[in-house]
C-alpha cells in the first residue's frame, strides 16, 4: 500500500502591482497533480508582515490571493498543498511548505522619512493629509505623495500640494469616487540632491478619519415648567443623520456645566425656575454604526438665552 504524497505549489511568489501595499500572492499547481484529477486540491496559505506575531491563514482552491500589507516592513508567506481525505481514502495529505518573502529595499535613513503624517476626511467629502519634513533633511528635499484604492487602475500622484518654504508638506485630494469602506493606501517618498530619502507607507479607511462640520440651527423649546428641549440640525453635507453622535456642553448661570453624549438631534434639560441664563454648544462625530473611529467636529457657535423668562415657548438666538 504505497503512501500518497503531493508536491508543494510551484513558483510561489509575492507580486507587487504598484498599489502601495496591496499585494498579490501567486503560485502554480504542484508537479504531478494530474494523478488527482478527480480531486479538488486546496492550498493552505499563511502570511504576515515580518515582526507580526500572528499569521493570517487562508484555505483556497485558487492559484492567487490578494491582501494589503504594511510596506514599511517585510512580508513573509508560506503555502502548501492539501489533498482532502476524500482524495486519499483516509486522512488529509499535506505537502511540504513552499516559502517566499518580499520587501522594498529601503533607501535613506529612517529619520529622512516624513514625520507626523496626519490625514483627515473633512465632512466625508475632502481628504487632506499633512506632514512635517524628515529630521535633518535639507531644504532641497521634496516629498511626493501617491495614493491608491480599489477602483483605481493605478496609483495616482497628488496634484494639489500644500507648500511651506517651497517644500511639499501636505496634499489636498480631488474628489475620491467610491473610496470609503475599503483600504486607502498612501506612499510618501522624497528626493534630494544630497542624500536618499526613506519612503513611508500608510493605510487607513476614509470613513474612520472623518471630521464632520459642527451642527447648525441650535434652538431652545420649553417643554414644561422644569424641562427645556435643546435642538439642532445635522451639518450640511453627505453624512446621513443616522451616522452622527453628538456631544453637548451646557452652562447654566455660569456655574453648572453639563456634558452629555447623545445619538439624536435633541436633548432635554431639567431646569429650575431660578435659571437666568442658559448656553449650549454641540459638536458631532461619526458613530459606530458608520465607522470604527472618527474625529470630533469643532464646537458649534454658542446658543444662549439670558435675562428673559424661560417660560417663553421658543427661544432663538
Amino acid at each position: 500500500d504505497t503512501e500518497i504524497k503531493v508536491n508543494p505549489p510551484q513558483d510561489f511568489e509575492i507580486v507587487d502591482p504598484g498599489y502601495l501595499g496591496y499585494l498579490y500572492l501567486q503560485w502554480q499547481p504542484p508537479l504531478s497533480l494530474d494523478h488527482f484529477k478527480e480531486c479538488t486540491v486546496e492550498y493552505e496559505l499563511k502570511y504576515r508582515n515580518i515582526g507580526s506575531e500572528t499569521w493570517k491563514t487562508i484555505i483556497t482552491k485558487n492559484l492567487h490571493y490578494k491582501d494589503g500589507f504594511d510596506l514599511n516592513k517585510g512580508i513573509e508567506a508560506k503555502i502548501h498543498t492539501l489533498l482532502p481525505w476524500q482524495c486519499t481514502n483516509g486522512s488529509e495529505v499535506q505537502s511540504s511548505w513552499a516559502e517566499t518573502t518580499y520587501w522594498i529595499s529601503p533607501q535613506g535613513i529612517p529619520e529622512t522619512k516624513v514625520q507626523d503624517m496626519d490625514c483627515v476626511y473633512y465632512n466625508w467629502q475632502y481628504l487632506l493629509c499633512s506632514w512635517k519634513p524628515g529630521i535633518g533633511v535639507l531644504l532641497d528635499t521634496n516629498y511626493n505623495l501617491f495614493y491608491w484604492y480599489e477602483g483605481l487602475d493605478h496609483a495616482l500622484q497628488c496634484v494639489d500640494y500644500i507648500k511651506a518654504d517651497g517644500q511639499n508638506i501636505g496634499c489636498r485630494f480631488p474628489y475620491l469616487e467610491a473610496s470609503d469602506y475599503k483600504d486607502f493606501y498612501i506612499c510618501v517618498n522624497g528626493s534630494s540632491e544630497n542624500k536618499p530619502i526613506r519612503s513611508s507607507y500608510f493605510t487607513f479607511q476614509l470613513q474612520n478619519i472623518v471630521k464632520p462640520l459642527p451642527p447648525v440651527y441650535l434652538t431652545f423649546t420649553r417643554e414644561s415648567s422644569c424641562e427645556i428641549k435643546l435642538k439642532w440640525s445635522i451639518p450640511l453635507g453627505p453624512i446621513p443623520a443616522r451616522c452622527f453622535d453628538y456631544e453637548i456642553e451646557i452652562r447654566e448661570d455660569d456655574t453648572t456645566l453639563v456634558t452629555a453624549t447623545v445619538e439624536n438631534e435633541t436633548y432635554t434639560l431639567k431646569t429650575t425656575n431660578e435659571t437666568r441664563q442658559l448656553c449650549f454648544v454641540v459638536r458631532s462625530k461619526v458613530n459606530i454604526y458608520c465607522s470604527d473611529d472618527g474625529i470630533w467636529s469643532e464646537w458649534s457657535d454658542k446658543q444662549c438665552w439670558e435675562g428673559e423668562d424661560l417660560s417663553k415657548k421658543t427661544l432663538l438666538r
Epitope: Q10, D11, E13, I14, V15, D16, P17, Y24, Q26, Q28, P29, L31, S32, L33, D34, H35, F36, K37, T40, V41, K61, L63, H64, T100
Partner: antibody, heavy 122, light 107 residues
Framework: EVQLVESGGDLVRPGGSLQLSCAAS????????MSWVRQTPDRRLEWVAT????????YYADSVKGRFTISRDNARNTLYLQMSSLKSEDTAMYYC???????????????WGAGTTVTVSS | DIVMTQSHKFISTSVGDRVSITCKAS??????VAWYQQIPGQSPKLLIY???YRSTGIPDRFTGSGSGTDFSFIISSVQAEDLALYYC?????????FGGGTTLDIK
Amino acid sequence: EVQLVESGGDLVRPGGSLQLSCAASGFTFSRNGMSWVRQTPDRRLEWVATVSSGGSYIYYADSVKGRFTISRDNARNTLYLQMSSLKSEDTAMYYCARQGTTALATRFFDVWGAGTTVTVSS
Amino acid sequence: DIVMTQSHKFISTSVGDRVSITCKASQDVGTAVAWYQQIPGQSPKLLIYSASYRSTGIPDRFTGSGSGTDFSFIISSVQAEDLALYYCQHHYSAPWTFGGGTTLDIK
C-alpha cells in the same frame, strides 16, 4: 482581445547582441507566467525561457543558459529577451507565449504572438 | 531532458476521415501533454492540454488521450481547414520540449 506583439528581431552577426520585446494586452499581465519559444528554419519548436508572473522564478533551456536573459516589466505589460553571444543556431522565429494556468496544470502555452525573426549570419 | 517523438512526419487524409497522430515521451509525464496546431503562415495555437482537455473555443472534433508515455491526438472528421502542422509538447517539468511535428495533408 488578448494580444502579444513581438518586436526587435533583426539580422545580426555571430557574437552579437539583440533585445526582443513583447507587448501584451487584453489580460492581466502580472497574473501569468510568460515564455519565449522559437521555431527554427526546419520548423522545429524549441522552448527558450520562462519567467513567472512576478519575475521571481526564471527557467532557461540549456542551449541558451548564460547567453540569454528573460525579464518582464509588469508596469509596462512587456516581456523581454536579451540575447548575447549569438550563434548561427539561434536563427529562428521567436514567439512570445503566455503560460496557460489551470487548477491542475501549467507550463503549456495558451496564447502566442505572431513572432519576430532573428537571423544570425556573417 | 524528456524527448517527445512524433513518429509520423506526414499524414495524408481526406475530408471527413478520422485521423490519429501519436506522440511518445521518453519518460513518464503523467498526463502533462499539450497539442498545438500551426496553420501555414500562422503562429501555433493551443488545442489540447493535460492530454485530454480542450482549450477554449476548440471544436469537439479534436480530442486527446493518453497518459504515462503514450499519447494520441484525434480529429474525428477532418475538415479542409485542418491542413496544418501538429505538435505535441510535455508540460511536466523543465525543460519543456516539443515533438518534431506531424504535417496533416488533405488529399
